[in-house]
């Protein structure tokens, strides 16, 4: 990842958007922005629940942990955190619940040590594909990000820009292959109906993936094969009906994986037989004894682990001539 000692000279050819921030007088070492609380000893700045409409320009250079939660930022422009000298130590940035609806390309540029970013609970109607990569090059400089928290960033239905929300988020995750070093990705509570098939293959360093509380119906086209280091996969509270053989085999092949599958509407018919057999043998699934059938009605609340092949039947499809209206 980027060196945490970028020199100010790297700003000399910056785009115009940097002008105001970069030309500002550098803050005094002990200066704390208005409406914020600062601790130099803890290297922490908290600007919390202050209805700020923009990122303070006079952040102290020592800041390592920056909390900008509960504000009214609306838009994060390019270079929102670019300063001279740069915020070279900033490692953790929390922007959750700050009414952000737009994050522009290059919003997090010039933060060479940024390891953890939390944008949760913002209605992100417009997340630039280059929000995290900073450039539109096919291969960008690697982002230093290791943890990216994007829980509940789905905007209200009427604010979505007539495009796939899943596609918009994934485009930002994959742009320029900048996030190859990402190890924790949280995408819970985003109404995802599907997971684009190429997203996981391009995040090979993932250790923790949280997709809980979405609306995922199937993982048929999702490949986990490359995720050698994946340790936790949270799929609780989705709309999964069954996991098929290919998915089961891939999960079983991951040496350290723990999968969480609670509260999905499992359909216990003949298509469930392979999954039930696998569940009985695997140590991969946490709390597997809690998984129960939701459909068909006659199977509701039956424990998957207690089913046998005789329980898992599919109603025969009647030929058209025998169907009643």
């Amino acid at each position: 990842s980027s060196s945490p000692t970028s020199s100010a000279s790297s700003f000399s050819s910056s785009a115009p958007f940097l002008a105001s921030a970069v030309s500002a007088q550098p803050p005094l070492p002990d200066q704390c922005p208005a409406l914020c609380e600062c601790s130099e000893a803890a290297r922490t700045v908290k600007c919390v629940n202050r209805n700020l409409t923009e990122v303070p320009t006079d952040l102290p250079a020592y800041v390592r942990n920056l909390f900008l939660t509960g504000n009214q930022l609306a838009v994060l422009p390019a270079g929102a955190f670019a300063r001279r000298p740069p915020l070279a130590e900033l490692a953790a940035l929390n922007l959750s619940g700050s009414r952000l609806d737009e994050v522009r390309a290059g919003a997090f540029e010039h933060l060479p040590s940024l390891r953890q970013l939390d944008l949760s609970h913002n209605p992100l109607a417009d997340l630039s594909p280059f929000a995290f990569s900073g450039s539109n090059a096919s291969v960008s400089a690697p982002s230093p990000l290791v943890e990216l928290i994007l829980n509940h960033i789905v905007p209200p239905e009427d604010e979505r820009q007539n495009r796939s929300f899943e596609g918009m988020v994934v485009a930002a995750l994959l742009a320029g292959r900048a996030l190859q070093g990402l190890r924790r990705l949280e995408l819970a509570s985003n109404h995802f109906l599907y997971l684009p098939r190429d997203v996981l293959a391009q995040l090979p360093s993932l250790r923790h993936l949280d997709l809980s509380n979405n609306s995922l119906v199937s993982l048929t086209y999702v490949s986990f094969r490359n995720l050698t280091h994946l340790e936790s996969l949270h799929l609780e509270d989705n709309a999964l009906k069954v996991l098929h053989n290919g998915t089961l085999a891939e999960l079983q092949g991951l040496p350290h994986i723990r999968v969480f599958l609670d509260n999905n509407p499992w359909v216990c018919d003949c298509h469930m037989a392979d999954m039930v057999t696998w569940l009985k043998e695997t140590e991969v699934v946490q709390g597997k004894d809690r998984l129960t059938c939701a459909y068909p009605e006659k199977m509701r609340n039956r424990v998957l682990l207690e089913l046998n092949s005789a329980d898992l039947d599919c109603d025969p499809i009647l030929p058209p001539s025998l169907q009643t209206s």
Epitope: S3, E147, G181, H208, H229, P255, H256, R258, E283, Q286
Partner: antibody, heavy 114, light 113 residues
């Protein structure tokens, strides 16, 4: 926190099991490692056990040491100790994101002598 | 097996001075930056100072700085204080198809005059 126990004086060849007890976190969510330090010497990595139980060992420790776990403890078994195994043995938790030892026990002393 | 070579093995510094400790790995650490630094005082377990090559652990003073990537890493202590007298170890993490491997450097004793 983590706390090691089981260190004592043993004669060469007598199997010895050290135990690391974890409190305040779940061992199923963390990797745990054993590290040793001979008197007046540096740190030496022994091996590691993953959240789900996979184990990896230093080349010198394969066949000489075995790491296992329960829901609350991680054990290190030294199958046939020699005098060269005299050391303080530390148990350490591995960060859930980074591959670094971010929580250490105080260590337990093993002395192998005839 | 991977080897971490730490230099020097011992260094002396005056209060307020600067100490530089080098750590060279026989092969690249995982993701080029899985290198940690620890401080150990007599009779105590090691204490994590820096992880991910350059990230300061919680509560560690900013006079400690880690840098480097791949196979070459450095720990710098600026404005050395008497409390910094200790032995410092680097630790690398490695991954291959056969699994994980960790290694420690031989240690550097820092004496504060």
């Amino acid at each position: 926190s983590v706390e090691e126990s089981g260190g004592r004086l043993v004669t060469p060849g007598t199997p010895l099991t050290l135990t690391c007890t974890a409190s305040g976190f779940s061992l199923s969510s963390y990797w745990m490692s054993w590290v040793r330090q001979a008197p007046g010497k540096g740190l030496e990595w022994i091996g590691i056990i993953a959240g789900r139980g996979s184990t990896y060992y230093a080349s010198w420790a394969k066949g000489r040491c075995t790491i296992s776990k329960t829901s609350t403890t991680v054990d290190l078994k030294i199958t046939s100790p020699t005098t060269e195994d005299t050391a303080a043995y530390f148990c350490a938790r591995v960060s859930s994101i980074y591959y670094t030892f971010n929580l250490w026990g105080q260590g337990t002393l093993v002395t192998v002598s005839s | 097996a991977q080897v971490l070579t730490q230099t020097p093995s011992s260094v002396s510094a005056a209060v307020g001075g600067t100490v530089t400790i080098n750590c060279q790995s026989s092969q690249s650490v995982y993701s080029n930056n899985e290198l940690s630094w620890y401080q150990q005082k007599p009779g105590q377990p090691p204490k994590l100072l820096i992880y991910y090559a350059s990230t300061l652990a919680s509560g560690v003073p900013s006079r400690f700085k880690g840098s480097g990537s791949g196979t070459q890493f450095t720990l710098t202590i600026s404005g050395v204080q008497s409390d910094d007298a200790a032995t410092y170890y680097c630790q690398g993490s490695y991954y291959s198809g056969s699994g994980w491997y960790y290694a420690f450097g031989g240690g550097t004793e820092v004496v504060v005059k």
